[in-house]
Amino acid sequence: WELTILHTNDVHSRLEQTSEDSSKCVNASRCMGGVARLFTKVQQIRRAEPNVLLLDAGDQYQGTIWFTVYKGAEVAHFMNALRYDAMALGNHEFDNGVEGLIEPLLKEAKFPILSANIKAKGPLASQISGLYLPYKVLPVGDEVVGIVGYTSKETPFLSNPGTNLVFEDEITALQPEVDKLKTLNVNKIIALGHSGFEMDKLIAQKVRGVDVVVGGHSNTFLYTGNPPSKEVPAGKYPFIVTSDDGRKVPVVQAYAFGKYLGYLKIEFDERGNVISSHGNPILLNSSIPEDPSIKADINKWRIKLDNYSTQELGKTIVYLDGSSQSCRFRECNMGNLICDAMINNNLRHTDEMFWNHVSMCILNGGGIRSPIDERNNGTITWENLAAVLPFGGTFDLVQLKGSTLKKAFEHSVHRYGQSTGEFLQVGGIHVVYDLSRKPGDRVVKLDVLCTKCRVPSYDPLKMDEVYKVILPNFLANGGDGFQMIKDELLRHDSGDQDINVVSTYISKMKVIYPAVEGRIKAHHHHHHHHHH
């Protein structure tokens, strides 16, 4: 019996087609993805093959103005239109709190939404009961297939699930649910979830009875043969894991942003054993036409977005200096504003010992593309912010050793004075440079804001300590020459859309007045400094 699994993950509000790098579509003839194009391909496969499942492994929420405006209603509407068969909850589904998941998505979705390792407690338990499930048994042709869901247990640090949801260890939570499916005589089981490729592989290895793992969160691109676009494969598609009980378990993921449709064909014997699997992600490029009815629907929903982008979010009573003359040479108040917004967006008081789990932010000055003038009645709009942050990136959470941060700050000024983008703006960090020293040895003081403290204060950076830092995904991926971050990071979790983070902060503050306040100091002459 042959099953075709079509899968997406980490779509992040890319409802419209995008450019090849998943940013805003400029030249339509070269654009990719989007739900209208996805629908064309899905329907083509549904017509050609008898047993097809369309699955999503989480993180539909967050990523473009679509989510900012529609807050998840767009996800439910268009996933219903595409007739998804099941979805797993990702960490970003909790970005607007549990209410922001229940009302727009859980109550509106016509497909099951799954997670076996999220347990509700207290008053929420009855409110959310039945709206998401640990597993669902789906009829496919003459057979049944069990789908069991899972979600990153790091979600409380990455999003806003509140205090009434407990995120259990994935493997511990999945095993009893899979065992239950076995007792129900379901002998074909797919684990669908959002914990990253390493956890996907562990689930394949450790959870007895799982036949296939369809994952997300790590934006992993797998491919067999010559890849069709710029993404470099992390391994073959499917990636085959030998389980501890000796079975071959295919593991798949389909990169992100709706650029590809994962396509996996699985052959089961009469006992439900996987005896072969093959496939590849399908690049959704312009050779696949956009479905006209879905496209018309997209255009209808689009109108509200254009109106939104000119509305006032809040006011500034100071000039927001985002000029390259400032942000690539010294501390600029636009950099401070953005970093403060990044930290504010990551406030998660999950432990009495810590005022917050993260206190530090770094931001490449070259990523700040425009100032905002306060002499326009102080008004700040989404449109203004889109000029400051035009690249459609995310502000991510990484874990780094102090020694890596020190290297990053040396890189920040290794060719100072040439108006290059790598000059770092900061939050929760005080750095002093001596620019008369040779490149690679210019950081003379680097103090960081404590997290395990009731009164935050600055302490010298410790080389061997592991720190959490919020930064643009561009830097996490080694952009602007920050190869040391990419090579040495210990953990990387994708965060919220950059503009969304700043707009939310401005809306929350109502009136802003960021200052230049001595976070970054530089001098050009020899002074006697103690090294730290």
């Epitope: 390493e198 085959i240 009980d245 000796g246 014997d269």
Partner: antibody
């Protein structure tokens, strides 16, 4: 094409240790499992364990746990099996094998004869 | 551990003969059975896995069948190069186990 080349025959005294190597070529070493199999003269094959060089996931047959150690050097595309506290019943040909998606022991090394004798 | 018992232990046949080797598992192994051919002084070669899937390059005269505890390897028309020892193996669960072998000799 896929090739697994094993180290040469070894003669060891009881109580000693031996380390057999298996050099892989013709494919991406970190993408496939390496299995180790023992065959005593005129006896059936016995599975010792596996190692996945991609993340060094290792699994042993309980029967061989304790005295056998599987390791891999990604940079050298080489897997190793070490047997310690050798006894006469360890005299055998030891094979490494690679899987191929849904086939377990798909490609085999030529075998390494280990003789334990005082 | 699952025991795999082959029969016969040895077998004489002529070129062109149809030959069947059976393998009995001590418990249900579904269709998770592989077959190997081994010649003296050489490493085993995979012939069949998942009961009836031929490995790359294996001639079509080799076929497998069975399910549960009883499995069979059939060689439809013996060729001179087929005289060797054949092993079955279960890949249903760890520890993987092999049969004791069937030696196929020229009559």
């Amino acid at each position: 094409q896929v090739q697994l080349v094993q180290s040469g025959a070894e003669v060891k005294k009881p109580g000693a240790s031996v380390k057999v190597s298996c050099k892989a070529s013709g494919y991406t070493f970190t993408n496939y499992y390496i299995y180790w199999v023992k065959q005593r003269p005129g006896q059936r094959l016995e599975w010792i364990g596996w190692i996945y060089p991609g993340n060094l996931n290792i699994k042993y047959n309980e029967k061989f746990k304790g005295r056998s150690t599987l390791t891999a050097d990604k940079s050298a595309s080489t897997a190793y099996m070490e047997l310690s506290s050798l006894r006469s019943e360890d005299t055998a040909v030891y094979y490494c094998a690679r899987d191929d998606n849904y086939a377990w022991f798909a490609y085999w090394g030529q075998g390494t004869l280990v003789t334990v004798s005082s | 551990d699952i025991q795999m018992t082959q029969s016969p232990s040895s077998l004489s046949a002529s070129v062109g003969d149809r030959v069947t080797i059976t393998c009995k598992a001590s418990q249900d192994v579904s269709t998770a059975v592989a077959w190997y051919q081994q010649k003296p002084g050489k490493a085993p070669k995979l012939l069949i896995y998942w009961t009836n899937t031929r490995h790359t390059g294996v001639p079509s005269r080799f076929s497998g069948s069975g399910s549960g505890t009883d499995h069979t390897l059939t060689i439809s028309s013996l060729q001179p190069e087929d005289f060797a020892t054949y092993y079955c193996q279960q890949h249903y669960s760890t520890p993987f186990t092999f049969g004791q072998g069937t030696k196929l000799e020229i009559k």
